[in-house]
């Protein structure tokens, strides 16, 4: 059962940066206060390599980038959504090494992020699926690579 104590805390504390999305019991987070340089360093040192490993054997031109982001907080919002929210044709990327490291980076360098994830965890456990790399998943990870590249170049004008 969803802990309504949390709903109470969030409703009385209107200054908080969380919004409740009852669909899927997922709490979203405003990434404005993250330490972007530390997250960038984590991406460059390890997450990027894990994404490349996942995509190995796929041509870089195989997929068109259809997801974009306008600034670093927006990029992290899109990255989180694409990494952790199940989509049609790609049930879950959450078990992948790049996903675990992404979650770690957000937990470490985005103050308060972990608290938005506690209840999402319960829903995730019920939705566990067999790990299969589908073409749809490859396309999704290709989009993620584009979002991360955009995150690392925040001063570029939006196309």
């Amino acid at each position: 059962m969803f802990p309504f104590a949390l709903l109470y805390v969030l409703s009385v504390s209107f200054r908080k940066i969380f919004i409740l999305q009852l669909v899927g019991l997922v709490l979203t987070y405003d990434f404005t206060n993250c330490d972007f340089e530390k997250i960038k360093a984590a991406y460059l040192s390890t997450i990027s390599k894990d994404l490349i490993t996942y995509m190995s054997g796929t041509k870089s031109t195989e997929f068109n980038n259809t997801v974009s982001c306008s600034n670093r907080p927006h990029c992290l919002t899109e990255i989180q959504s694409l990494t952790f929210n199940p989509t049609a044709g790609c049930a879950s990327l959450a078990k992948e090494m790049f996903a675990m490291k992404t979650k770690a980076a957000l937990a470490i360098w985005c103050p308060g992020y972990s608290e938005t994830q506690i209840n999402a965890t319960q829903a995730m456990k019920k939705r566990r699926k067999r790990k299969v790399t589908t073409n749809k998943c490859l396309e999704q990870v290709s989009q993620l690579q584009g979002l991360w590249r955009r995150f690392n170049r925040p001063l570029l004008k939006q196309q």
Partner: antibody, heavy 124, light 107 residues
């Protein structure tokens, strides 16, 4: 089930350094952080710093900045805390603790598994 | 660093009493707060995380509340094994800080 086993008691001279180890077993070492906390005799708990083996990143309490170094060796699932320029006020029990967990199913920021503690005595 | 102020520093109570310990943060920490219990010569034990989530295996007589800067640990009916020292700890961002502790003694 994760267990943390720390190295034995140490007696050190003022001005010297001490290095305490914390060996983890029963879990994926890189999927959680390790915190170091100390407790002087009859005093409260004092957070010293964290290490995140997944990124090799450490951060420290302002009070200990420049005097403490926290490292991790993923190959042996061991974290280390080195404190330099020891003084008598550093006499304390030093604990390591598992801090959060960053796997597929997210955990919290609490310290849920603790080592047995290592007594470090600084005396001339 | 964020400062944590706990009150009272000690209290005397009897078995069956309702006990409340408060913790105040020097700045908004959302709900990034934990509570620990420590007995003499032992490592601390995690009771509450995320301000009000009960750690697995901890009796339901323990509860936490609060958000932002003000937090409370409540023991609804004090048991003999609950006489100990209690600490709050914030973990907002990458730093952490403990409160100075509250010793719960037998009246």
């Amino acid at each position: 089930q994760v267990q943390l086993v720390q190295s034995g008691a140490e007696v050190k001279k003022p001005g010297s350094s001490v290095k305490v180890s914390c060996k983890a077993s029963g879990g994926t070492f890189s999927s959680y952080a390790i915190s170091w906390v100390r407790q002087a005799p009859g005093q409260g708990l004092e957070w010293m710093g964290n290490i995140y083996p997944i990124f090799g990143y450490a951060n420290y309490a302002q009070k200990f900045q420049g005097r403490v170094t926290i490292t991790a060796d993923e190959s042996t699932s061991t974290a280390y805390m080195e404190l330099s320029s020891l003084r008598s006020e550093d006499t304390a029990v030093y604990y390591c603790a598992r801090y959060g967990q960053y796997g597929q199913h997210f955990s919290h920021g609490g310290m849920d598994v603790w080592g047995q503690g290592t007594l470090v005595t600084v005396s001339s | 660093d964020i400062q944590m102020t706990q009150s009272p520093s000690s209290l005397s109570a009897s078995v069956g009493d309702r006990v409340t310990i408060t913790c105040r943060a020097s700045q908004d920490i959302s709900i990034s707060l934990t509570w620990y219990q420590q007995k003499p010569g032992k490592a601390p034990k995690l009771l509450i995380y995320g301000a009000f989530s009960l750690q697995s295996g901890v009796p339901s007589r323990f509860s936490g509340s609060g958000s932002g800067t003000d937090f409370t640990l409540t023991i609804s009916s004090l048991q003999p094994e609950d006489f100990a020292t209690y600490y709050c700890q914030q973990y907002y961002g990458t730093s952490a800080t403990f409160g100075q502790g509250t010793k719960v003694e037998i009246k």
